[in-house]
């Protein structure tokens, strides 16, 4: 049931990409949603050598990825925040999961280049912005809606119910001779018709 | 400043066993690929092995592989060289160094090692 | 392993004159838009310095009577005008591939 519920939420998810509203924007596409995940691409030129490779929110270092080369130009491919990443010979991509509406932000690809020299330090970056479905804000919308009104007509059926029983009840229990009566009242009714006609 | 202060060099019979260290300061010792180069006395520089920034990837010159191991302490800004059954032709001035990226941009002013009986 | 080797093993020249040392390497240190050749210099009861790197990069700090150029195999390291802090042995050296190997020098005086 709860694993239902997830997947419901996570097709709920939809990512909407504002880029180009920032200095230093990324002129290529910059995230990518798949999975109820979103990956993140942070482009660097072919030419570079050694790198690192930092992806930012806001101002808080999320991921990092470090590619150096020993004297025997041996490749050591690190990272101290380490998430889900793919390194091309000119991107690297971060992978982001369970996203939710905290994930929309300013996020930025940091990317300090060591080799060739000299050293440099590039920022890209662009808004990630998480938005619902069309389709998933009306069923959220209508869905409590709904359930408090089934609640709502549940609740006054059994009152109704209840009332109606209630009332029965004590209409039996107050006049035991209710039914008599009314037969009776009949009784004399076609009595008094009959005499007339005979009068 | 940059510096590399190498120790442990010293007399050792052939056979013998020696721990050389490198006390690196100046600069963040755990960003970079760490080396050893050797020269002996009158000679050429011969490189001798090199270690990655986090002491995962080593790699050693095909005369002393299998007798010397590489190795760093990030922590205590070191770096290591523990060299075993120790030969004459291992007689040599050992430097340590810093791979910057695109050449060995610091050296220490090295630590003698005599093998001799 | 990659062979350098180097020449002449040694030179003198006058000060003020240019010097040319020249490394060879057994196979191509080109890869992409790079030459994995550096030059040092060690002079006497020093530990080597870094002169050159890329075959044509100054260290930063390297006075620019230095220079490098060549590709491929074939390498040159050049003095414009030798001054007497030169006198050093100057070594190329390769990082192309493992184990990286170094020339056997070559040493530089002042005629």
């Known amino acids: 049931m709860k694993s239902g519920l997830w997947y419901f939420f996570l097709f709920c998810l939809r990512i909407k990409v504002l880029t180009g509203e920032i200095n230093g924007s990324a002129n290529y596409e910059m995230f990518i949603f798949h999975n109820g995940g979103v990956q993140i691409l942070c482009k660097y030129p072919d030419i570079v050598q050694q790198f690192k490779m930092q992806l930012l929110k806001g101002g808080q270092i999320l991921c990092d990825l470090t590619k150096t080369k020993g004297s025997g130009n041996t490749v050591s491919i690190k990272s101290l925040k380490f998430c889900h990443s793919q390194l091309s010979n000119n991107s690297v991509s971060f992978f982001l999961y369970n996203l939710d509406h905290s994930h929309a932000n300013y996020y930025f690809c940091n990317l300090s280049i060591f080799d060739p020299p000299p050293f440099k330090v590039t920022l890209t970056g662009g808004y990630l912005h998480i938005y619902e479905s069309q389709l998933c804000c009306q069923l959220k919308f209508w869905l409590p809606i709904g359930c408090a009104a089934f609640v709502v007509v549940c609740i006054l059926g059994c009152i109704l119910i209840c009332w109606l029983t209630k009332k029965k009840y004590s209409s039996s229990v107050h006049d035991p001779n209710g039914e008599y009566m009314f037969m009776r009242a009949v009784n004399t009714a076609k009595k008094s018709r009959l005499t007339d006609v005979t009068l | 400043e940059v510096q590399l202060v190498e120790s442990g060099g010293g007399l050792v019979q052939p056979g013998g066993s020696l721990r050389l260290s490198c006390a690196a300061s100046?600069?963040?010792?755990?960003?970079?690929?760490m080396d050893w180069v050797r020269q002996a006395p009158g000679k050429g520089l011969v490189w001798v092995s090199n270690?990655?920034?986090?002491?995962?990837?080593?790699e050693y010159s095909p005369f002393v592989k299998g007798r010397f191991t590489i190795s760093r302490d990030n922590a205590k800004n070191t770096l290591y060289l523990q060299m075993n059954s120790l030969r004459a032709e291992d007689t040599a001035v050992y430097y340590c160094?810093?791979?910057?990226?695109?050449?060995?941009?610091?050296w220490g002013q090295g630590t003698l090692v005599t093998v001799s009986s | 392993d990659i062979v350098m080797t180097q020449s002449p093993d040694s030179l003198a020249v006058s000060l003020g004159e240019r010097a040319t040392i020249n490394c060879k390497s057994s196979?191509?240190?080109?890869?992409?838009?790079?030459?994995?050749l550096t030059w040092y210099q060690q002079k006497p009861g020093q530990p080597p310095k870094l002169l050159i790197f890329?075959?044509?990069t100054r260290e930063t700090g390297v006075p620019d009577r230095f220079s490098g150029s060549g590709s491929g195999t074939d390498f040159t390291l050049t003095i414009s005008s030798l001054q007497a802090e030169d006198v050093a042995v100057y070594y190329c050296?390769?990082?192309?591939?493992?184990?990286?190997?170094f020339g056997p020098g070559t040493k530089v005086d002042i005629k």
């Open positions: 160094t810093r791979w910057g990226r695109f050449g060995f941009d610091s």
């Open positions: 100046g600069f963040t010792f755990s960003d970079y690929w």
């Open positions: 270690i990655d920034e986090s002491g995962s990837i080593t």
């Open positions: 196979q191509s240190l080109l890869s992409g838009s790079f030459n994995y």
């Open positions: 890329y075959a044509s």
């Open positions: 050296h390769h990082h192309y591939n493992a184990p990286p190997t």
